[in-house]
Amino acid sequence: SGTLKKVAGALDGSVTFTLNITEIKVDYVVWTFNTFFLAMVKKDGVTSQSSNKERIVFPDGLYSMKLSQLKKNDSGAYRAEIYSTSSQASLIQEYVLHVYKHLSRPKVTMGLQSNKNGTCVTNLTCCMEHGEEDVIYTWKALGQAANESHNGSILPISWRWGESDMTFICVARNPVSRNFSSPILARKLCEGAADDPDSSMV
């Protein structure tokens, strides 16, 4: 039995489940999805398929399977069972497919803001509007004094009035795409708290 391979696919995109079986004399391969029969491919190239005929092809003329126009519910376990006359038992290759959406622009919200002794302190939180899965967030802090990266969805900010302005950008990534937020300027962000030296706002 082969190892379990994790495969990522993009919504509306395609994915190929690759079989590397050059050393074996294959008679036929049976493909299943969550135990449901998908296709059988014989060595003469003849295939018998269940549904999804328009979405499943065997591109190399051999046994690897390409699945197109991916939907969210295509996520799951795929299995290739390889039958050979030269082997008593069938060989098995298993895959787990996860279909991801392309990320839209992440949204940024500001937490409670305080202004003490001319220093504006707050948190910026980055998130995807529709709560997408497996998203990794990175913050870029840009300015004359800094060019730093910060991992995680929450960025703690401490900016002193009179310092050069800073720009904050949130970058969101998932296995199939990446996107970034609108830039946020420290000066604009902190303007609300500027009038009152000890103010707090949400």
């Epitope: 495969v7 994915v15 392309h102 840009l142 990266s149 720009t167 970058v171 990446r178 609108s182 830039p183």
Partner: antibody, heavy 119, light 107 residues
Framework: EVKLLESGGGLVQPGGSLKLSCAAS????????MSWVRQAPGKGLEWIGE????????NYTPSLKDKFIISRDNAKNTLYLQMSKVRSEDTALYYC????????????WGAGTTVTVSS | DIVMTQSHKFMSTSVGDRVSITCKAS??????VAWYQQKPGQSPKLLIY???TRHTGVPDRFTGSGSGTDFTLTISNVQSEDLADYFC?????????FGGGTKLEIK
Amino acid sequence: EVKLLESGGGLVQPGGSLKLSCAASGFDFSRYWMSWVRQAPGKGLEWIGEINPDSSTINYTPSLKDKFIISRDNAKNTLYLQMSKVRSEDTALYYCARPDGNYWYFDVWGAGTTVTVSS
Amino acid sequence: DIVMTQSHKFMSTSVGDRVSITCKASQDVGIAVAWYQQKPGQSPKLLIYWASTRHTGVPDRFTGSGSGTDFTLTISNVQSEDLADYFCQQYSSYPYTFGGGTKLEIK
């Protein structure tokens, strides 16, 4: 040292095909999005497309989508550009480029490989 | 596609001078703009990203500015080694697009 080295360029007839390669070294190739960019003689830069680390997403400039195919082999640390149905306007220097920190701007470029389309 | 227009194909300057190269986007790209330098016979080299952040090792005489649709690369105290083509690039939306380039000539 981080390096990209393109190869496979040459003279090709109109309507013909060619496959370019880009060998990467000095960094973890399997973690990076990678792009192809071309530059026609005496002209500006044109982004062709990009591929994500596991090949599940490939984005192209719309006008080139039907004639170019980008692929990669992480085991070989190599990026590919399959060109088909080439025309004289595809004559250019072809660069592969790596985005800085996986962002969208390119800090590492190869020296390029020249493709000349002529009969 | 977003069109990046560099209206000056050529710019002439003298060593020690200050020169500004402009780039105009056909629609708002925020600050998602990079600048590259390409010396004769060489590959492009990243100078500026996020409109104004200098890439590692780039001399501080190179300054990027702008947001929205209008961007500028300013070279102060121009040196003879700055003779090159300069390209802007937007990465706000697909497909990424470059300006046509500005060739800086040293008098």
